[in-house]
Interface confidence: low
Amino acid sequence: RTVPPMVNVTCSEVSEGNITVTCRASSFYPRNITLTWRQDGVSLSHNTQQWGDVLPDGNGTYQTWVATRIRQGEEQRFTCYMEHSGNHGTHPVSGKVLVLQSHW
């Protein structure tokens, strides 16, 4: 069986002028997934991104996330790219900044 992920992008302020953008994929199966951030269409180096573990979400499906830190005002340059079981999608940053605890 294949259950495609639901993908959600959020922003959190970490310091003046900087934000962390987090791309969360949830409710997907099987567990193999690719999530990566792109800037102007080019994949960011892996040392500039942080990944969460792929974890079961209790419903027989999985969840994970990837985050990166960017300059506020440059959100439109960044997209989250997802690949899962032959499907792919690109998800832009909304630009809405939430006050959340950072992953960094």
Epitope: N32, V42, Y81, G86
Partner: antibody
């Protein structure tokens, strides 16, 4: 059965453009990305670049001024073009599939094609 | 760029023995992005282990991988004649995505 097959000229003149095509079967390039890697005779492996399933490319910075990777999903092919070649570009060139969930590892490879740069 | 140094360059062992191959990175590599390949003469490389320790389907369980940070290891618990080949580690942590120079495993 997953297969990849490189094709193209085995001899290229210095300063010209090396052009190779990777024809795949057993999977679709709309669902798997592809890599190009090369191996000079008697030496190790060098990653050239990759193409994602949506057509975006990532290149080794060492080649970025002269490399182009493209895809033709209708023919199940992706291609490598390397311009301004020199003798240092003589190598076996491999195409490989980007595995799902294998964190960009190359899970299937073509058998490789030797390209010699010589006048 | 991240330089991967493999040691030893050549390892001479007999069938049935244990092989330990080392891969040292010049800077830290996420374990998710460290892979191992096997290459036999005249053949393309094949993926053995991805993300440091995950065995590809169909690869015998005498192969195993471990490590973190800058030090990674490929172990073959009991060598079979078909295991004698060149082994490469590969990192996709930071561009350019480099390979080690290889360890040649030869029959003693």
């Amino acid at each position: 059965q997953v297969q990849l097959q490189e094709s193209g000229p085995g001899l290229v003149k210095p300063s010209e453009t090396l052009s190779l095509t990777c024809t795949v079967s057993g999977f679709s390039l709309t669902t798997y990305g592809g890599h190009w890697i090369r191996q000079p005779p008697g030496k190790g492996l060098e990653w050239i670049g990759m193409i994602w399933t949506d057509g975006w490319t990532d290149y080794n910075a060492a080649f970025i001024s002269r490399v182009t990777i493209s895809v033709d999903t209708s023919k199940n092919q992706f291609s490598l073009k390397l311009s301004s070649v020199t003798a240092a570009d003589t190598a076996v060139y491999y195409c490989a599939r980007k595995g799902h969930g294998y964190y960009y590892a190359m899970d299937y490879w073509g058998q490789g094609t030797l390209v010699t740069v010589s006048s | 760029e991240i330089v991967l140094t493999q040691s030893p360059g050549t390892l001479s062992l007999s069938p049935g023995e244990r092989a330990t191959l080392s891969c040292t990175a010049s800077s830290s590599v996420s374990s998710s992005y460290l892979h191992w390949y096997q290459q036999k003469p005249g053949q393309a490389p094949r993926l053995l282990i991805y993300s440091t320790s995950n065995l590809i389907s169909g690869i015998p369980d005498r192969f195993s991988g471990s490590g973190s940070g800058t030090d990674f290891t490929l172990t073959i618990s009991r060598l079979e004649p078909e295991d004698f080949a060149v082994y490469y580690c590969h990192q996709y942590h930071r561009s350019p995505f480099t390979f080690g120079q290889g360890t040649k495993l030869e029959i003693k």
